[in-house]
């Protein structure tokens, strides 16, 4: 019952990882994460 990080993200395209409650697309280079996505394989809010 130790638990590990969730399984790999199964989303179309690259650069998805679990952020918050879902797999989210990461932010482009030079941007930072303002808020994670709120749906599976969604887009994070980046600044």
């Amino acid at each position: 019952q130790g638990g590990t990080r969730s399984p790999r993200c199964d989303c179309a395209g690259d650069f998805h990882k679990k952020i918050g409650l879902f797999c989210c697309r990461g932010c482009p280079a030079g941007h930072y994460l303002k808020a994670p996505c709120t749906e599976p394989c969604g887009n994070s809010t980046c600044l």
């Epitope: 130790g2 638990g3 409650l21 879902f22």
Partner: antibody
């Protein structure tokens, strides 16, 4: 054995505040996303708040700005600070663990709940 | 928000019966190759228990008489042969987006 034990419920007047606690054991608490879900007597389930293992918090519009979820991994504890309480917040509040096989929120273990009654 | 409508709200059945409960979402809960619909069982005075995740996957330890199906907006929970311990209330839940929402429940009672 996974265990989630809620506490802190009780009777509070409208406009008042209450802090619920959930003591977790039997698993590595810091690795898991966690939620609070409530159920009014004889009614269905309503998701109230979530705290992801990587530090993000999430709320539905019905409680945003009034409720605050927090966690203390060193104490294996989840909390729900409830302010500006209304009669409609009266319910049993459950602490729930999200399944670690899932990259989406689904709850695989639940506590037995703590009753919050908002009444004058 | 996605509204979840369960039907029937209650039903009476006998031990050994095949029972079907439906859940309809106000918009599709299927995306990226998965249907983000889950089912729970709750007995009076007890916490909910996860039965089915991603529409059709049986949670570990749940008897095989429980099954789930569906995609898009329409989903079904089936109990192939109702047992005495299955008399309870059943809820669907989506995780297609936030906020998470649950159906209103279906109470399965003894005929």
């Amino acid at each position: 054995e996974v265990q989630l034990v809620e506490s802190g419920g009780g009777l509070v007047q409208p406009g008042g505040s209450l802090r619920l606690s959930c003591a977790a054991s039997g698993f590595t608490f810091s690795n898991y996303d966690m939620s609070w879900v409530r159920q009014a007597t004889g009614k269905g389930l309503e998701w109230v708040a979530a705290f992801s293992s990587d530090g993000y918090t999430f709320y539905p519009g019905s409680v945003k700005g009034r409720f605050t979820i927090s966690r203390e991994n060193a104490k294996n504890s989840l909390y729900l600070q409830m302010n500006s309480l209304r009669a409609g917040d009266t319910a049993v509040y459950y602490c729930a663990r999200h399944a670690d096989y899932a990259n989406y929120p689904v709850m695989d273990y639940w506590g037995q709940g703590t009753l919050v009654t908002v009444s004058s | 928000d996605i509204q979840m409508t369960q039907s029937p709200s209650s039903l009476s059945a006998s031990v050994g019966d095949r029972v079907t409960i439906t859940c309809r979402a106000s918009k599709s809960v299927s995306t990226s190759g998965y249907s983000y619909m889950h089912w729970y069982q709750q007995k009076p005075g007890k916490a909910p228990k996860l039965l089915i995740y991603l529409a059709s996957n049986l949670e570990s330890g749940v008897p095989s008489r429980f099954s789930g199906s569906g995609s898009g907006t329409d989903f079904t929970l089936t109990i192939s042969s109702l047992q005495p311990e299955d008399f309870a209330t059943y809820y669907c839940q989506h995780s297609r987006e936030l906020p998470l929402t649950f159906g209103g429940g279906t109470k399965v009672e003894i005929k």
